[in-house]
């Protein structure tokens, strides 16, 4: 079953290559287990950036080597992606799945265009 998902259209990563955005979903029922996936679309290719499954009221748990962190509050998730470089500029899509209890719902946002600008190297100070 389909579900509405909203996210910002554009986000600019900071000088340390970190970008944060909110992913909000219209929960149609009492889900207790939710899965959030961040997908990156660039040059018509879609790749998974990170994913986390969480129980309502608990923290999101990404894999230890994940570049993502996040927190949840109700039906919104605050996502942070770290270690971004200019080459990582692209459309980052939030996918939300209500895993339990049935029925299963899935929604995909329109994507957040994340712009990453590599910082200029500091000039040598002689």
């Amino acid at each position: 079953k389909a579900m509405h998902v909203a996210q910002p259209a554009v986000v600019l990563a900071n000088s340390r290559g970190t970008a944060s955005f909110v992913c909000e979903y219209a929960s149609p029922g009492k889900a207790t287990e939710v899965r959030v996936t961040v997908l990156r679309q660039a040059d018509s290719q879609v790749t998974e950036v990170c994913a986390a499954t969480y129980m309502m009221g608990n923290e999101l748990t990404f894999l230890d080597d994940s570049i993502c962190t996040g927190t949840s509050s109700g039906n919104q998730v605050n996502l942070t992606i770290q270690g971004l470089r200019a080459m990582d500029t692209g459309l980052y899509i939030c996918k939300v799945e209500l895993m339990y209890p049935p029925p299963y719902y899935m929604g995909i946002g329109n994507g957040t265009q994340i712009y990453v600008i590599d910082p200029e190297p500091c000039p040598d100070s002689d």
Epitope: V22, E24, A26, S27, G29, K30, T32, G74, N75
Partner: nanobody, 126 residues
């Protein structure tokens, strides 16, 4: 801090109609999605309708779709639930709840709401 107060409940005959109001006596409601729920004696709390911050997004479970309509007037800091063709099984205590969100969506899950009113009794009986 929003504080919610429901009103408009009462005794109504089967087939009749009622309009419930949910007003905030604290913060402005325009930053909050609002949901209506009811609890019948001896039953779990049931979702009825929700409306996003701007009013453009609404959602209903199949059980009340077509009979219940949720609207909001942000200028009056109030959300309304219009109920028509009421049945005996609509009897219960009706609660509104609020959740601060970033975008325009809303949730039908009671788990997502952190601020609740005290409720207003609706009795459908001849």
């Amino acid at each position: 801090q929003v504080q919610l107060v429901e009103s408009g409940g009462g005794l109504v005959q089967p087939g009749g109609s009622l309009r419930l109001s949910c007003a905030s006596s604290g913060d402005t409601l325009e930053s909050f999605a609002v949901g209506w729920f009811r609890q019948a004696p001896g039953k779990e709390r049931e979702e009825l309708a929700c409306i996003g911050r701007t009013g453009e997004f609404t959602d209903y479970p199949g059980s009340v779709k077509g009979r219940f309509t949720i609207t909001r007037d942000n200028a009056k800091n109030t959300v309304y639930l219009e109920m028509v063709n009421l049945k005996a099984e609509d009897t219960g205590v009706y609660y509104c709840a609020a959740e601060r969100l970033v975008f325009h969506l809303c949730s039908l899950s009671e788990y997502d709401y952190d601020t609740w009113g005290q409720g207003t009794q609706v009795t459908v009986s001849s």
